[in-house]
């Protein structure tokens, strides 16, 4: 951007510049071209020697300029147009300047002026061109600086040329106010900071509703001496609730939102949200719908699932296999898990209570992802009720629960009562008993044993009787022994696990029950 301090051509002859000597050297002239007056300062005293004609501009306020550019448009006539080449004729003129803090008015003193340059034309106007009105216009530019006073004058010295000065334009350069990457850069005077640093670094200001991204660099640009912006660094982003539209940040329209400062546009409110107001940073969930803490704001709001479908409990002696299908309504989420709880009731008293501690699950009964689980170690003559609850990421945000229940009665044998009959260093003789009324239902007994503390030495023996001798055991070793009745329906109740110890090789006769 050029900031013009003086423009002779634009002033339409209204500038009364000082001429010295008055009226005999430079003077203002008017010509009409295309019905428009063209003004020029001209001088053409080529036949008289010793010309020293000065034309001084009015005082020009410097404003913020440090270096100024002077553009001259002028014509110079060929000295050969004049008789004998006019020995005193010249084809150049001199350009001067003087700085001052005040306007000296008509007080003109040559000694105050410093020469900028001798101005020579690229093209001179020869006689034939002049008479054919085909004058050759020259354009020359000079730079002056640094300036330090409040203002300055320019002066043109004629020493015997035939010159017409049509345009004098004085300006300085600024990098214009600019919007770039949502940052506003102020109008900046184009100055070289130093010879080695020809660029001025300028910090930008984020436009309304834009911010420097977290951890990012603030916007910077470089203003060159030629008044051009270069090398943008950093950026601004539209803050939450606003999106970039051309060079501004505009509030998200109703029904749209933006949750963070980013380059992304506003997003439409997802499903199951209420219509947002202008400039929304999120969209509220509809009643009955929720957002889990880890859910992105762009995700639809969801709700807890309905209860599992078709829960079945299949009794297999002292075991039950629970099977169910996924809820009809998943609540719009994929993160469904199931949890199983167990309640047992005594038929005689009708008393009920939780049974998690006494039963065994084939896998942990909380946060199940599969739709089946086996429950074992059920007690005979007991009614069990199993509840399977479906949960998802937003279930914790409501108090109601979505579960289905199934009940099963266990008409199993009572667990065998086991005791150690005899032992040696390498064997254990174990006996058991069950109520006579249940004996007819028992098909066989299954004895499982292993060394205590050794999960890999698992052994099973089956027998139809009420005793078994376990051989080939290690001396002075504790074994874990359990007896379970096998019935037509499957496994019956198992006895509790007993610890029996073989004798040491010294032959101690102690019995452990």
């Amino acid at each position: 951007k050029e900031v013009v301090l003086l423009d002779f051509a634009a002033m339409k002859g209204e500038l009364g510049w000082l001429t010295h000597p008055y009226g005999k050297g430079w003077d203002l002239m008017q010509n009409i071209m295309d019905d428009m007056p063209i003004y020029m300062y001209s001088v053409c005293n080529v036949v008289s020697g010793d010309q020293d004609n000065w034309l001084r501009t009015n005082w020009v306020y410097r404003e913020e300029a440090e270096r100024i550019f002077i553009e001259l448009k002028f014509t110079v006539r060929d000295c050969n147009s004049f008789p004998g080449g006019a020995s005193s004729c010249k084809e150049t003129f001199n350009l001067y300047y003087a700085e001052s803090d005040v306007d000296y008015g008509t007080n003109f003193q040559k000694r105050q002026f410093t020469k900028i340059d001798t101005i020579a034309p690229d093209e001179i106007t020869v006689s034939s061109d002049f008479e054919a009105r085909n004058v050759k216009l020259n354009v020359e530019e000079r730079m002056v600086g640094p300036l330090t006073r409040k203002g300055f004058y320019l002066a043109f010295q004629d020493i015997g040329a035939c010159v017409a000065l049509l345009s004098v334009r004085v300006y300085y350069k600024k990098c214009p106010e600019m919007l770039q990457s949502l940052a506003r850069f102020p109008e900046t005077i184009a100055v070289a900071v130093s010879d080695t640093q020809p660029l001025a670094t300028v910090a930008g200001t984020c436009v309304d509703h834009a911010v420097v991204p977290y951890g990012g660099e603030g916007p910077l640009m470089h203003c060159t001496v030629d008044g051009e912006w270069l090398v943008p660094i950093g950026q601004c982003l539209c803050q939450e609730g606003y999106e970039k539209v051309e060079d501004a940040c505009r509030a998200c329209s109703p029904g749209f939102f933006k949750s963070e400062a980013s380059e992304s546009p506003c997003l439409e409110c997802p499903e199951h949200t209420l219509p947002s107001t202008e400039g929304a940073t999120s969209c509220q969930c509809e009643e009955g719908y929720f957002r889990a803490p880890e859910d992105p704001l762009s995700m639809s709001c969801t709700r807890p699932p309905s209860a599992p479908n078709y829960l079945t409990a299949i009794g297999m002696g002292a075991k039950v296999e629970l099977r169910w299908t996924a809820p009809k309504d998943t609540g719009g989420r994929q993160d469904i898990v199931y949890s199983v709880t167990c309640e047992q009731c005594w038929p005689e008293s009708g008393e009920c209570g939780p049974c998690e501690a006494s039963v065994r699950y084939s896998e942990p009964p909380h946060a199940l992802t599969r739709t089946s689980v086996t429950v074992s170690d059920l007690e005979p003559h007991m009614n069990y009720t199993f509840a399977v609850e479906a949960r998802n990421g937003v279930s914790g945000l409501v108090t109601s629960r979505s579960f289905r229940t199934a009940s099963v009665s266990i008409n199993q044998t009572e667990p065998p009562k086991v005791r150690l009959e005899d032992r040696s260093t390498t064997s254990l003789s174990v006996t058991w008993s069950i109520p006579v009324s249940q004996q007819s239902r028992v098909w066989k007994y299954e004895v499982t044993y292993r060394k205590k503390g050794d999960a890999n030495s698992y052994n099973v023996r089956r027998t139809e009787g009420f005793s078994v001798t376990l051989d080939d055991l290690a001396p002075d070793t504790t074994y874990l022994v359990q007896v379970q009745a096998l019935t037509q329906e499957g496994q019956g109740a198992g006895s509790k696990v007993h610890e029996f110890q073989t004798l040491s090789t010294e032959g101690s006769a102690n019995m452990a029950v």
Partner: antibody, heavy 120, light 110 residues
Amino acid sequence: QVQLVQSGGGLVQPGGSLRLSCAASGFTFSSYAMHWVRQAPGKGLEWVAVISYDGSNKYYADSVKGRFTISRDNSKNTLYLQMNSLRAEDTAVYYCARASVGATGPFDIWGQGTLVTVSS
Amino acid sequence: SSELTQPPSVSVAPGQTVTITCQGDSLRSYYASWYQQKPGTAPKLLIYGENNRPSGVPDRFSGSSSGTSASLTITGAQAEDEADYYCNSRDSSGTHLTVFGGGTKLTVLG
């Protein structure tokens, strides 16, 4: 409208003095250089003097230098020519004229003229 | 010298073209201005610069210049054009500020 109205002419004896006035109207008087031009009876036009727009510069024809003084009062929009040591050859119709641009003209507005007769 | 020389008189038949000339060294450097003066009135500017006419001046008046000569041409002269015509120019010698030609009396015959 734009005009120059002159006054102050008359008969004066040789060696006498006279002051001519030229009242301007219809334009910004203080922006223009002003001239006096005279015309002896039956003769051509002769340039006499010029004054710059602000009164800071004055020039005279050799024939009147030292005897005539050109001045102006921009607050009154008036141009003056003080003529001293008048001679018979100064007898003429005196015109004030406006230089349309610069110092030297052209002269686009002229007064109606006022006759100065120097005779004993 | 700083003189401008004009013919003392010229004549023209109505409707014909007439040219009045002005000679002088200053005209090599500066354009002439032309003035018309009718008896008992002040001069009136006709032409200035390259060939510029102030508003109100009929376009039958035109100016030209070449070397040390300037010309005023009246194309299709009319009876009311009978008057004295003066050329004027800046003085390139620096002796004077401005100079007038001696004037030319134009007679429109008939």
